[in-house]
């Protein structure tokens, strides 16, 4: 049998049974997250699980730029440090850096100092570059 | 009830540079909004300039970015505008404004300054 | 030249209905909201409609917005004599990552 490759929506990059689209138009996060979804196929704000998919995408985005940070589906919606992803994924691969995390930033981004590898938190309502991601 | 104020010269010299602060009172600059520079030549329409988060990051319209430079002072509460090497195109009246996040979505100018004018001539 | 299109002037009788209209592109009104200012002689412009059909708290319900595919519209029904003003259309543009306005349409009453 010969096992076809499913394909992504045009402008989107797959990896490991995902679709991932990087947008370069300015959205705050939940306006990014609304927008994931409206390209259907129960697209969310990105999901980063292990080193392996961060280090594809990261190596993608840097394609494109390497100074503007993009949103990613990590968010704190109790404002209690309790993360989660908004597609429902396990919290279990983490890879903050080490800036500090206090103050009103609920909501991760993919950070531009570390070639996109780590991550920070920022204020949900800054306009930024963001990342969505599907499984086809 | 958040209030704006723009202050600076009114009048600065050709190739000069045009230098504006917007004094905000009744909220903080430190808010999650961003702060907007909005200009109107004389009876002419509206041009947006650029726009400022309190942590220093900004957007600037592409076609003056080589020109704008914004900052923010959270000490103050106040925010700024430079626009260099001005012409008499950039002759206007300049307004402050703060910017809040829709709860559907999208952004809007909720409060704005009274304006400043703003001649370029020698 | 305005990257959205407003015709530069509108009128009506008091009363009346009047539509003012906004056109743009894929990459502005296609994507995002529309937000709609009014600016009295004079005086700062002043939000009246944001998110494309939101009514601000100070505007009248006589004033109702509308999108369709990458145009917008003002409509003010019930005019009134202190609705002659001028308005700007506005929105965010993907492409250049800013916020672009229409000309300004001058409405009167007449």
């Known amino acids: 049998d010969i096992i076809m490759r499913p394909s992504c929506a045009p402008g989107w990059f797959y990896h490991k049974s995902n679709c991932y689209g990087y947008f370069r138009k300015l959205r705050n996060w939940s306006d990014a997250e609304l927008e994931c979804q409206s390209y259907g196929n129960g697209a969310h704000l990105a999901s980063i699980l292990s080193l392996k998919e961060a280090s594809t995408i990261a190596e993608y985005i840097s394609g494109y730029q390497r100074s503007q940070p993009i949103w990613i589906g990590l968010h704190d919606p109790q404002k209690r440090q309790q993360w989660q992803w908004i597609d429902g994924a396990m919290y279990l691969y983490r890879s903050w850096s080490g800036k500090s995390m206090g103050g009103n930033k609920h909501c991760a981004e993919m950070s531009s100092n570390n070639n996109f590898l780590t991550w920070s938190s920022n204020e949900c309502n800054k306009r930024q570059h963001f990342l969505c991601k599907y499984r086809p | 009830q958040v209030q704006l104020q723009e202050s600076g010269p009114g009048l600065v010299k050709p190739s000069g540079t045009l230098s504006l602060t917007c004094a905000v009172s009744g909220g903080s600059i430190s808010s999650s909004n961003y702060w907007s520079w909005v200009r109107q030549p004389p009876g002419k329409g509206l041009e947006w300039i650029g726009e400022i988060y309190h942590d220093g990051s900004t957007n600037y319209n592409p076609s003056l970015k080589s020109r704008v430079t914004m900052s923010a002072d959270k000490s103050k509460n106040q925010f700024s505008l430079k626009l260099s090497s001005v012409t008499a195109a950039d002759t206007a009246v300049y307004y402050c404004?703060?910017?809040?996040?829709?709860?559907?979505?999208?952004?809007?100018?909720?409060?704005w300054g009274q304006g400043t004018l703003v001649t370029v001539s020698s | 030249q305005s990257v959205l299109t407003q015709p530069p002037s509108a009128s009506g009788t008091p009363g009346r209905r009047v539509t003012i209209s906004c056109s743009g592109s894929s990459s502005n009104i296609g994507s995002n909201p529309v937000n709609w200012y009014q600016q009295l002689p004079g005086t700062a412009p002043k939000i009246v409609m944001y998110s494309t059909d939101q009514r601000t708290s100070g505007a009248p319900d006589r004033f109702s917005g509308s999108k369709s595919g990458t145009s917008a519209s003002l409509a003010i029904t019930g005019l009134q004599s202190e609705d002659e003003a001028d308005y700007f259309c506005?929105?965010?543009?993907?492409?250049?990552?800013?916020?672009?306005f229409g000309g300004g349409t001058k409405l009167t009453v007449l």
């Open positions: 506005a929105t965010w543009d993907d492409s250049p990552n800013a916020v672009v």
């Open positions: 404004a703060r910017d809040s996040p829709s709860y559907s979505s999208g952004w809007y100018s909720d409060y």
